[in-house]
């Protein structure tokens, strides 16, 4: 028969900094050998070469050395491409072209996404506030993609739409920083919430500020960090926010700033003697030197790893001193599950089959749910195992044993409990003798 090249109909959603698999499969004829195979991945629009396999050999990446095939799976018809450290610029359509004797191609879309950080809220003016004063509340959320939707509401959940100005600016990596400004007249007290939504990830990041007029300042060095854990995706950069209140006339020469791991007290990064003393943590940390004088002691942690998860203490000493701890919660999304069936040929009603649902490289451990075509949960005869690789990421394999009816759909949902991200796969088995896999 003809060479059939298959790719997913839906776009592959990949998080910036993570690896993505662009799935592509073909149907090899009996007796097929890799010496016969020509495989080309290219950008659909510009036809720029991305990766190729020819003359029985992987010819390598022509795309910034960030692509790889799965050489051990090629002979079985798996022509998928692994794209490492995804960037915003990678978004678009990739064509998988396979030529043996016959040839065929199909295009798969890559949709890039990056979650927005928990918004930081600033108030202007922020001192001696009284009912009736007009204040400007700025909600800032960073390093997301694509552009965000921003919503404001009051303490009762009523939307605030008037006097809102939102701007979004892309940085050199193409990630957006969003700044939304709300101007309000203060009541006796009030809570103002800002919600930043990533339309692709359907991820909401929110923060609120409660303004109680007539707060008295303490005069002490006040070190402030976010109450909620900072959620960072493996491979991306994270900002551990920390701010302090500099006194008038404060100079950086007076500042001692130390970031350390809360539990072990291991030094992470420091600033003293008027100078950034650099990273003591695998050279993956940086301060924001231009912002220190304004009281911004935040720490940038690059290429986040699972092992980074935990509590970091920000210690500020000028004349007075203070500290606060911020938690880093590491996460990695699970891949779209792949489904396998055993046995996978000549299936008939009454046969017992084993359906395996596999999802890869997520963190933390996943929750796995099975259900039938009517959405009824399947809990009996399910065995789930999760194994961490050397980077601490989990591969999850869940096995369901079922007796086939006349026909049936079996769905597997792999949930990341931190990202509240669901990845699902399903298989439909029809009653007449059939061969797996059908297209899900």
């Amino acid at each position: 028969g003809a060479l059939e090249v298959q790719v997913p109909e839906d776009p592959v959603v990949a998080l910036v900094g993570t690896d993505a698999t662009l799935c592509c499969s073909f149907s090899p004829e009996p007796g097929f050998s890799l010496a016969q195979l020509n495989l080309i991945w290219q950008l659909t629009d510009t036809k720029q070469l991305v990766h190729s396999f020819a003359e029985g050999q992987d010819q390598g990446s022509a795309y910034a050395n960030r692509t790889a095939l799965f050489p051990d799976l090629l002979a079985q018809g798996n022509a998928s491409l692994r794209l490492q450290r995804v960037r915003v610029a990678d978004e678009g359509s990739f064509t998988c072209f396979v030529s043996i004797r016959d040839f065929g191609s199909a295009a798969v879309s890559l949709q890039v996404a990056a979650p927005y950080s928990k918004p930081s809220m600033t108030l202007e003016p922020n001192k001696d506030l009284r009912p009736g004063d007009t204040v400007t509340i700025t909600c800032s959320s960073y390093q997301g993609y694509p552009e965000a939707e921003v919503f404001w509401q009051d303490g009762q959940g009523v939307p605030l739409t008037g006097n809102v100005t939102t701007s979004q600016m892309a940085n050199e990596q193409g990630l957006f920083d969003v700044h939304s400004i709300l101007r309000v007249v203060l009541g006796a007290n009030g809570t103002y919430s800002c919600l930043v939504r990533n339309p692709v990830l359907q991820q909401d990041a929110h923060s609120s500020v409660t303004i109680t007029p007539q707060r008295s300042p303490t005069g002490a060095v006040e070190v402030q960090v976010p109450e909620d854990p900072v959620v960072a995706l493996v491979g991306t950069d994270a900002t551990l926010r920390c701010s302090f209140s500099p006194e008038p006339g404060f100079s950086l020469a007076q500042l001692n700033l130390i970031w350390q791991l809360t539990d072990t007290k291991q030094l992470v990064h420091s600033f003293t003697e008027g100078r950034d003393q650099g990273s003591a943590y695998a050279n993956r940390t940086a301060l924001f030197p231009d912002l220190l004088a304004q009281g911004n002691a935040s720490l940038r942690l690059q290429r986040v790893r699972v092992a980074d998860e935990g509590s970091f203490t920000c210690f500020v000493s000028i004349r007075d001193f203070g500290s606060a701890a911020v938690s880093l919660q590491v996460a990695a999304p699970y891949s779209k599950p792949s489904m396998t069936l055993e046995p996978n040929k000549d299936l008939r009603p009454g046969d017992t089959v084993t359906i395996t649902c596999s999802s890869y490289r997520g963190y933390p451990e996943a929750e796995v749910f099975w259900q039938d075509g009517q959405g009824v949960p399947l809990t009996g005869n399910v065995t789930t195992s999760q194994m961490a690789n050397e980077q601490g990421l989990f591969d999850v394999h869940s096995v369901l044993r079922v007796v086939l009816g006349a026909n049936g759909t079996y769905s597997c949902l792999v949930r990341n409990p931190v990202l509240q991200q669901d990845a699902h796969g399903s298989v439909t088995i029809t009653g007449q003798p059939m061969t797996f896999p059908p297209e899900a």
Epitope: G219, A220, N256, I258, Q260, E273, D320, S323, A324
Partner: antibody, heavy 116, light 108 residues
Framework: GASVVESGGGLVQPGGSLKLSCAAS????????MSWVRQTPDKRLELVAT????????YYPDSLKGRFTISRDNAKNTLYLQMSSLKSEDTAIYYC??????????WGQGTLVTVS | DILLTQSPASLSVSVGETVTITCRAS??????LAWYHQKQGKSPQLLVY???NLADGVPSRFSGSGSGTQYSLKISSLQSEDFGSYYC??????????FGGGTKLEIK
């Protein structure tokens, strides 16, 4: 001039509790971090607790965490150290000292705590 | 915690001589180091802060130097009131800010 005066020391049995006080005068106490430092019979100095100017942040060596509590009352210009589950190795002269960022300037004359 | 090692532990010298006491830190303390003098039966008195700065009222025969992990206190032309014990203390990082073991200076 500036001075700090410790009080509350004395003889206590093992397992007992004691609360030390330190009265400050002659400087703006409410803007200074403060520490309790002890000097053991072998003359070694050990910082046992530190508190920042508004009392929000407190620090202890891991070995003493849970047994000692430092606190302050800025309205009264007074620093406190609550000690519980005392052991013989807590026998020392306890000094109250300022901890202004990178310098320790004002020290008291000390109060003797004997656990026996 | 950072360990401060003082040397020598004791020394015996005559009035008018010059002595140097050293303090080695187990890691860089970035000049956040103080020196104290303690006379028998008295509380410690601050001599030097941030490694090189003399505290108010301290005679100029005392001088502090050093950086990184190595620091020293030099006393030129020793006077009788200079005898007693000397301690270093760092103020780097999150407390506890530890002390050196002390140096006992005796009259020969």
């Amino acid at each position: 001039g500036a001075s700090v005066v410790e009080s509350g020391g004395g003889l206590v049995q093992p397992g007992g509790s004691l609360k030390l006080s330190c009265a400050a005068s002659g400087f703006t106490f409410s803007t200074f971090g403060m520490s309790w430092v002890r000097q053991t019979p072998d003359k070694r100095l050990e910082l046992v607790a530190t508190i920042n100017s508004d009392g929000v942040n407190t620090y202890y060596p891991d070995s003493l965490k849970g047994r000692f509590t430092i606190s302050r009352d800025n309205a009264k210009n007074t620093l406190y150290l609550q000690m519980s589950s005392l052991k013989s190795e807590d026998t020392a002269i306890y000094y109250c000292a300022s901890a202004e960022g990178r310098r320790g300037a004002y020290w008291g004359q000390g109060t003797l705590v004997t656990v026996s | 915690d950072i360990l401060l090692t003082q040397s020598p532990a004791s020394l015996s010298v005559s009035v008018g001589e010059t002595v140097t006491i050293t303090c080695r830190a187990s890691e860089n303390v970035y000049s956040n180091l103080a020196w104290y003098h303690q006379k028998q039966g008295k509380s410690p008195q601050l001599l030097v802060y941030t490694a090189t700065n003399l505290a108010d009222g301290v005679p100029s025969r005392f001088s502090g130097s050093g950086s990184g992990t190595q620091y020293s206190l030099k006393i030129s032309s020793l006077q009788s009131e200079d005898f007693g014990s000397y301690y270093c203390q760092h103020f780097w990082g999150i407390p506890p800010w530890t002390f050196g073991g002390g140096t006992k200076l005796e009259i020969k």
